[in-house]
């Protein structure tokens, strides 16, 4: 289905990508009413932003090209430091080269800013999306995906890394956010909740969805993730909400049916290649976009987030399999693996469609409070 409070239009049809009907507003808990238990434990225990090292003190690093990313963030956590002999590296996402960012968890210690200082940044992800406040940007064209339909061979690695289930993608999956904004898909992973508890990372007007898929991409302007971290537009993530529907999703079943094999933290298996685009909504034209960060350490900023308006439907059994099969660190179930939403701190979320227009009878005038900042306008 579509996200709440969207302009009505004709349904695009369900299929594996879900229906395109709007959620009723009565389904949306208000911010005050939403139970705090939906947020992962521990994040509230982090010191307030004013208690953390401010990134505005770090030297600014200009993006390599003015067209990388739609927002020009002034205080990205980017520090040039000597490292590899080939080229200077952007090292702000770690304290020193030897730091091991694998030792973190959802909730409890260590606080993420101690694992990676960038986690205390001002422009973090995930965020709460409020369609009424989104800026309609006609310049945001439909996403273009090429090479996402993979043959069965060679097989792909499906891994339980203790934080999520991750499918590593081969070279050749190309994605364009627009002209000159080209990326290659690196991996996809999921975030989920627990029985009766939703676990998406992004929320919409405070509403948390059952689960969320992230497809992580590297800009073709960069050779490696290490060089792209913290650079505006260096990484881009396509995100879609997963919801409960009446039918089994055959695309997701190809992965979910293999989860038992990787129940143990650190375990992995090989799965036949599949149509990666079938894991995403079918409507590539309607989405929200903003500049944020990785949602796990190293929390590097400059990440372009594209959150689909249309959701993906999985059966109740599939959502249960997702949230109830894997184990994480310390003999605990791998559940509720989402980060609490982060403040926008002045960022404007852009929409590729007039998301702020409410077609219900109560809205006499369309409300569009923010103007478009998209590159190319």
């Amino acid at each position: 289905q579509r996200l709440p409070r969207m302009q009505e239009d004709s349904p695009l049809g369900g299929g594996s990508s879900g229906e395109d009907d709007p959620l009723g507003e009565e389904d949306l808990p208000s911010e005050e009413d939403s139970p705090r238990e939906e947020d992962p434990p521990g994040e509230e225990d982090l010191p307030g932003e004013e208690d953390l090292p401010g990134e505005e003190d770090l030297p600014e690093v200009k993006p390599k090209s003015e067209e990388e990313g739609s927002l020009k963030l002034e205080d990205l956590p980017t520090v040039e430091a000597p490292g590899d002999p080939q080229e200077p590296q952007n090292n702000a996402h770690r304290d020193k080269e030897g730091d091991d960012q694998s030792h973190w968890r959802y909730g409890g210690d260590p606080p993420w800013p101690r694992v990676s200082p960038a986690c205390a940044g001002r422009f973090q992800s995930p965020v709460d999306i409020r369609p009424q406040l989104a800026a309609f940007c006609p310049a945001l064209r439909p996403l273009e995906l090429l090479g996402f339909q993979l043959p069965p061979l060679p097989e792909l690695r499906l891994r339980n890394n203790g934080h999520s289930v991750q499918l590593t993608l081969p070279p050749g999956l190309e994605m364009a956010l627009g002209p000159g904004r080209e990326y290659r898909a690196l991996q996809l992973h999921l975030h989920w909740g627990a029985a009766g508890r939703p676990g998406s990372e992004h929320t919409v007007e405070g509403h948390r969805f059952p689960a969320e898929i992230h497809v992580v991409h590297l800009s073709t302007a960069f050779a490696r993730v290490d060089e792209a971290l913290g650079r505006p537009g260096g990484l881009a993530v396509l995100a879609a909400f997963l919801e409960e529907g009446p039918e089994e999703n055959s695309a997701y079943e190809q992965l979910l049916s293999r989860l038992e094999e990787i129940a143990e933290e650190g375990s992995e298996t090989q799965v036949p290649g599949l149509d990666i685009s079938a894991l995403l909504p079918s409507d590539f034209s309607r989405y929200f976009q903003y500049e944020g960060s990785l949602t796990t350490p190293p929390c590097a900023q400059g990440v372009i987030w594209t959150v689909f308006n249309q959701t993906v439907m999985l059966s109740a059994k599939q959502l249960h399999t997702l949230s109830d099969t894997l184990w994480g660190p310390g003999d605990s179930r791998l559940q509720l693996n989402f980060r609490a939403t982060q403040p926008l701190n002045g960022r404007v979320i852009e929409a590729s469609f007039p998301a702020g227009v409410d077609s219900s009878p109560r809205a006499a005038e369309p409300v569009q409070l923010n103007s478009c900042l998209a590159a190319g306008d």
């Epitope: 030897g98 060679p154 934080h163 898909a185 991996q187 060089e227 990484l235 090989q270």
Partner: antibody, heavy 124, light 111 residues
Framework: SQSVKESRGRLVTPGTPLTLTCTVS????????LIWVRQAPGKGLEWIGI?????SAYYARWAKGRFTISKTSTTVDLKITSPTTEDTATYFC????????????????????WGPGTLVTVSS | ELVMTQTPSSVSAAVGGTVTINCQAS??????LSWYQQKPGQPPKLLIF???KLASWVPKRFSGSRSGIEYTLTISGVQCDDAATYFC?????????????FGGGTEVVVK
């Protein structure tokens, strides 16, 4: 300075297991991918296998079952399970040129530094 | 299985001339290709990474390019010191077996 170095090579008889060790200095193995490569006398370079920062190892098809790659915090081992005379070669280890982000599907696009290599001779 | 086909196996060039070495991947490897120079008794030395980027110690007469699954190493204005064997290395995956492969090598002889 960052470097890798293979342990001294040996003369072994066929069938006698042999472990080569790549010792690293100046960087943390927990953040880098390493490869093992070999070169028979007068021949080209042959990729044996790779171990990523999370300790997962993968091999060339011809090498699977014949070699095992593992690591500790400062060393990467290459075990030749049952050497044959065809395994006579100089063995090299090399490191991915930048920090590896395996959890992000990162792939190596070049290897540096390389060890000086060590000669293994398998002969009866 | 990734296969890297390198041509030619040997090439001769006069000082100041140009040498072109090609590598073709059996499947898409994007820019995950590197070039190495090896002299007798020495380990390989990284010349070019990410298909076209020069390592900091490499003279500007070396260059790398990519067109689809075909990769080219060019030495313009060959010097005596460039006499060596050159190898390409392609990486398709480090999360499956058979995910990387070297080309067969090209011996460059400088006259």
């Amino acid at each position: 300075s960052q470097s890798v170095k293979e342990s001294r090579g040996r003369l072994v008889t066929p069938g006698t297991p042999l472990t080569l060790t790549c010792t690293v200095s100046g960087f943390s193995l927990s953040r880098y991918t390493l490869i093992w490569v070999r070169q028979a006398p007068g021949k080209g370079l042959e990729w044996i296998g790779i171990i990523d920062s999370s300790s997962s190892a993968y091999y060339a098809r011809w090498a699977k079952g014949r070699f095992t790659i593992s690591k500790t915090s400062t060393t990467v081992d290459l075990k030749i399970t049952s050497p044959t005379t065809e395994d006579t070669a100089t063995y090299f280890c090399a490191r991915d040129r930048v920090l590896s982000y395996d959890d992000y599907g990162d792939l190596p696009d070049g290897f540096d530094p390389w060890g000086p290599g060590t000669l293994v001779t398998v002969s009866s | 299985e990734l296969v890297m086909t390198q041509t030619p196996s040997s090439v001769s060039a006069a000082v100041g001339g140009t040498v072109t070495i090609n590598c073709q991947a059996s499947q898409s490897i994007s820019n995950y290709l590197s070039w190495y120079q090896q002299k007798p008794g020495q380990p390989p030395k990284l010349l070019i990474f990410a298909a076209s980027k020069l390592a900091s110690w490499v003279p500007k007469r070396f260059s790398g390019s990519r067109s689809g699954i075909e990769y080219t190493l060019t030495i313009s204005g060959v010097q005596c010191d460039d006499a060596a064997t050159y190898f390409c290395l392609g990486v398709y995956s480090i999360s499956t077996d058979d995910g990387a492969a070297f080309g067969g090598g090209t011996e460059v002889v400088v006259k």
